[in-house]
Interface confidence: low
């Protein structure tokens, strides 16, 4: 057969738990070059289901800072600027991947972790339970 | 600042690009055990700014399948169930981390990548530009 040098090859993993342990290059490639990150920055104030952003910080996690949305009201803001409790402000949640240092304090060893974060809020019609 | 000692049990990195290249355990720890994943599953229909979910698939990426929200209307649904164009349905976007296989075909080598995804939609008051 044809011998192809190992130039384009894959890094070896010495880890016995392989394939669970992989090499990850943290030099992040950002595919959002054409997007304006500020374009949704004021939605939290202008929404009929406005929210506040809370800083969730954890030095053992990457990214270490995550912003969590908390809906300001149980109801939604109506055309008069008042809270309408016939509607509900609810958080839109998403599962995201983060890296957690494992063992703790190790600069070059992480575990992949799924966490649920609230990204913003939306206004929904409530589910009404009728009592017989 | 406080110096965090380097845990003596940390794996060494032979990689010349260290600390850019780290070891990651892919045996995912899910911290969402107490959450009900279905609890926001119908918000996309019940919202005053409803959205559809589109499957974004990429076999070079982990996770391979990401669901993208697309707002159904430019306006928002009013109390009569009609679209009110005095308000705007807008996507709530979030930057998330994904892993991209690099080099291709390598089962144990990835690069961290940031992508912008639309998680859901919210109803906002439009910004009105007054012409002098």
């Amino acid at each position: 057969g044809i011998t192809i040098p190992r130039n384009p090859g894959c890094p070896n993993s010495e880890d016995k738990n392989f394939p669970r342990t992989v090499m990850v290059n943290l030099n992040i490639h950002n595919r959002n070059t054409n997007t304006n990150p500020k374009r949704s920055s004021d939605y939290y104030n202008r929404s009929t289901s406005p929210w506040n952003l809370h800083r969730n910080e954890d030095p053992e996690r990457y990214p270490s800072v995550i912003w969590e949305a908390k809906c300001r009201h149980l109801g939604c803001i109506n055309a008069d600027g008042n809270v309408d409790y016939h509607m509900n402000s609810v958080p839109i949640q998403q599962e995201i991947l983060v890296l957690r240092r494992e063992p703790p304090h190790c600069p070059n060893s992480f575990r992949l972790e799924k966490i649920l974060v609230s990204v913003g809020c939306t206004c929904v019609t409530p589910i009404v339970h009728h009592v017989a | 600042g406080i110096t965090i000692p380097r845990n003596p049990g940390c794996p060494n990195s032979e990689d010349k690009n260290f600390p850019r290249t780290v070891m990651v355990n892919l045996n995912i720890h899910n911290r969402n055990t107490n959450t009900n994943p279905k609890r926001s599953s119908d918000y996309y229909n019940r919202s005053t700014s409803p959205w559809n979910l589109h499957r974004n698939e990429d076999p070079e990426r982990y996770p391979s399948v990401i669901w993208e929200a697309k707002c159904r209307h430019l306006g928002c649904i009013n109390a009569d169930g009609n679209v009110d164009y005095h308000m705007n349905s807008v996507p709530i976007q979030q930057e998330i981390l994904v892993l991209r296989r690099e080099p291709p075909h390598c089962p144990n080598s990835f690069r961290l990548e940031k992508i912008l995804v639309s998680v859901g939609c919210t109803c906002v008051t439009p910004i009105v530009h007054h012409v002098a």
């Epitope: - | 076999p59 982990y62 075909h105 089962p107």
Partner: antibody
């Protein structure tokens, strides 16, 4: 049903050129990495070239590097292999092969679907 | 690159027999092994991936095992349509490589 159909093979003289095509159907072509694999008469299989789903990344076996070019047209659901400076040792059946998806498991990607192949004969 | 040494190069068997084909990798490839079946004049067909996972639609008489450097494909209860050539394939590292093939003939 996933289908891959190669075309463009034939008899060519040493030093000549050929362009192979692979028409894909039954799946979303633009989602998948694709490959060319060849099989010399009565011999084993040899990976030739790879192209990523977007077409932005390509790889070649050393035996064809500089002579072969892989490309794709996602709007036409078609994979191509431009073969220049052909040699007698390039004589083989050429298959296009799809990389498997890798849902969740991060278990690596193998060739999950293959075409029927097209025969390339390099001879004077 | 990683060499995949497949044995035997051919085997004669009868319908109903149990046939085992082995593949040895030149270095540790963990479980990144796939097996293909190729009937004369047709395209290779994926049977097994990840050493032991059956591709959708493949009969359960096919099974795979092994880890590290030694792998095997077993056909339990050979059927007429199983007479073909079988290839192992490593996808642990570029360049992706294949075994030389094992031809399963009718006895």
């Amino acid at each position: 049903e996933v289908q891959l159909l190669e075309s463009g093979g034939g008899l060519v003289q040493p030093g000549g050129s050929l362009r192979l095509s692979c028409a894909a159907s039954g799946f979303t072509f633009s989602f998948y990495n694709m490959n060319w694999v060849r099989q010399a008469p009565g011999k084993g299989l040899e990976w030739v070239s790879y192209i990523s789903s977007s077409g932005g990344l390509t790889m070649y076996a050393d035996s064809v590097k500089g002579r072969f070019t892989i490309s794709r047209d996602n709007s036409k659901n078609t994979l191509y292999l431009q073969m220049n400076s052909l040699r007698a040792e390039d004589t083989a059946v050429y298959y296009c092969a799809r990389d498997s998806p890798d849902y969740g498991a991060l278990g690596g990607t193998y060739f999950d679907y293959w075409g029927q192949g097209t025969l390339v004969t390099v001879s004077s | 690159d990683i060499q995949m040494t497949q044995s035997p190069s051919s085997v004669s068997a009868s319908v109903g027999d149990r046939v085992t084909i082995t593949c040895r990798a030149s270095q540790d490839i963990r479980n990144y092994v796939a097996w293909f079946q190729q009937r004369p004049g047709t395209a290779p067909r994926s049977l097994i991936y990840g050493t032991s996972n059956l591709q959708r639609g493949v009969p359960s008489r096919f099974s795979g095992s092994g880890s590290g450097t030694d792998f095997s494909l077993t056909i339990t209860g050979l059927q007429p349509e199983d007479f073909a050539t079988y290839f192992c394939h490593q996808y642990s590292s570029n360049p992706l490589t294949f075994g030389g093939g094992t031809r399963v003939d009718i006895n």
